[in-house]
Amino acid sequence: ILLRAVTGFSGDGRAIWSKNPNFTPVNESQLFLYDTFPKNFFWGIGTGALQVEGSWKKDGKGPSIWDHFIHTHLKNVSSTNGSSDSYIFLEKDLSALDFIGVSFYQFSISWPRLFPDGIVTVANAKGLQYYSTLLDALVLRNIEPIVTLYHWDLPLALQEKYGGWKNDTIIDIFNDYATYCFQMFGDRVKYWITIHNPYLVAWHGYGTGMHAPGEKGNLAAVYTVGHNLIKAHSKVWHNYNTHFRPHQKGWLSITLGSHWIEPNRSENTMDIFKCQQSMVSVLGWFANPIHGDGDYPEGMRKKLFSVLPIFSEAEKHEMRGTADFFAFSFGPNNFKPLNTMAKMGQNVSLNLREALNWIKLEYNNPRILIAENGWFTDSRVKTEDTTAIYMMKNFLSQVLQAIRLDEIRVFGYTAWSLLDGFEWQDAYTIRRGLFYVDFNSKQKERKPKSSAHYYKQIIRENGFSL
């Protein structure tokens, strides 16, 4: 109440940029906190299917839009066939997970590995077997699976036949695919993510053309895609809530990614307003319909009136509250390259703690899973990834401060990524794994980097001990 009254803001995220130490929820003077995370804090690590599985056409897998995009748009990358070959070396992934001692493993299912043309008929047996074996092995190890249904690898057939996410026909097709996954894997999966970072799917897939399918320049398509992604997520949530939750007793969300931004002049109201616009145009675009009032943020509706689709009253009601927790991604993909439209002439910042505070204020202090966090190193860096450790310590410190000092309800943390792999438009020029993989080797051994040892220690101590 005090915060709202003093700042003049209506309790929304703009209060974060107020530098009055009495009223800003983030106390900058607390630079490092030696403390532990809450008991039973959920420690995990993640991968994306297209990034690590390899075997892009092996055992009946169909091509994805990214397989096609790699062959047509990315220079000097023949395929993801090299990658870390997780499809072949599943046991090596499991050993890596054992080494770190995580509570959960977040991975995605390759839609075209299960259904080569995207349509749910008879599943590809080898694909089904792969995911089933993985899940069984995780359960055996007491590692909770967090399963993402869509991490950007749309079956190419759906792109070619329907225009992909631009066409609302895909909403029902995605729901059919989700239903199949719930039916086949739901007995072993208690945490589901529908879509990973829809902002990047829409913005880079249809705006900049830097992601598959590589379309560019059509703002109406960008927001139509975003609209269909939100509606697809909502449909799947309702499906799970009605038909599967009663007996599977799991949780379902969508991973939303964002940058963070600071005003050029902290005392300047217009700069603060631009920072708010920046966050709203990236994170609010998807969070407001799902975690907020069921509609797009008002500023977006005004500014983008000619390209932003509308939700009917019934749809607003349907969208609202369709996430059981706030899954948040904070990593390089939302920073480089940053949409200049989103930057609003302000300064980008890696302050995860402030981003979490913004979410708290905007969306009524939800339970938060950090669903992707980490940084990257140059591809030449092997196992001595000191920068990655520095970044991890910094990020984890910010999460801990958010929990202990700001009373933000973060319940889990996903380090990204388990393995070096294919890094989207950056291909193999950067590495994000806690385990080093020599992509040119036959056996693709997973070698723990310094960051893997560091993360292992953090998990063992449940935080930072003096």
Epitope: N218, A220, K302, S306
Partner: antibody, heavy 123, light 110 residues
Framework: QVQLQESGPGLVKPSETLSLTCTVS??????????WSWIRQPPGKGLEWIGF???????NYNPSLKSRVTISLHTSKNQFSLRLSSVTAADTAVYYC???????????????WGQGTTVTVSS | QSVLTQPPSVSAAPGQKVTISCSGS????????VSWYQQLPGTAPKLLIY???KRPSGIPDRFSGSKSGTSATLGITGLQTGDEADYYC???????????FGGGTKLTVL
């Protein structure tokens, strides 16, 4: 103060193409919050929106006129133009150019209008 | 046939109050923002109300706007003879992807 001024022929023959230009002063046609617009008003009738163009080059046109309309920006001259092909007597009207504006704060609508230019379609 | 529906005419005596209605649907007024325009005889239209209920500088507070559901209303109090004009409502229609106007309402000050 932002001002718009329409210019072009007052008489066009049926089946020909109507061409009008709008010169902008006090604002830039490459400004990000503006949609540069054309509206017309047939004699004794109401306003009819023809279409607009955003600085990025994206256009929206009245569905009933879409097949005949082209709006384009000329940033170097700070102008925008209208072309309406295959005109008939039904296209006789006062043609206005306008600035349609919306930003994060406010949805303004058509906040600046030109004075209008009368175009008659007749042989 | 206009997408937005306005009464063709309204009238009232000087000093009185008058309201002009504008009715639409969820794809236009219901989910977008309404502007009102005044067109004095022989002149170009002028923005009177924007963003449902805001007045541009120079527009007296005798003019007000409101919106409820799929309808909008323009109110004019303290009528003056100089208010005699045609009044148009306008908004964006998300289904048509077009700006739409009402048919116009002729205000006569008796």
């Amino acid at each position: 103060q932002v001002q718009l001024q329409e210019s072009g022929p007052g008489l066009v023959k049926p089946s020909e193409t109507l061409s009008l230009t709008c010169t902008v002063s006090g604002d830039s046609v490459s400004s990000g919050d503006n949609y540069w617009s054309w509206i017309r008003q047939p004699p004794g009738k109401g306003l009819e929106w023809i279409g607009f163009m955003f600085y990025s080059g994206s256009t929206n046109y009245n569905p009933s006129l879409k097949s005949r309309v082209t709006i384009s920006l000329h940033t170097s001259k700070n102008q925008f133009s209208l072309r309406l092909s295959s005109v008939t007597a039904a296209d006789t009207a006062v043609y206005y150019c306008g600035r349609y504006r919306s930003d994060w704060d406010y949805y303004y609508g058509m906040d600046v209008w030109g004075q209008g230019t009368t175009v008659t379609v007749s042989s | 046939q206009s997408v937005l529906t306005q009464p063709p005419s309204v009238s009232a005596a000087p000093g009185q109050k008058v309201t002009i209605s504008c009715s639409g649907s969820s794809s236009n007024i219901g989910n977008n923002y309404v502007s009102w325009y005044q067109q004095l005889p022989g002149t170009a239209p002028k923005l009177l109300i924007y963003d449902n209920n805001k007045r541009p500088s120079g527009i007296p507070d005798r003019f007000s706007g409101s919106k409820s559901g799929t309808s909008a209303t323009l109110g004019i109090t303290g009528l003056q003879t100089g208010d005699e004009a045609d009044y148009y409502c306008g908004t964006w229609d998300s289904s048509l992807s077009a700006v739409v106007f009402g048919g116009g309402t002729k205000l006569t000050v008796l």
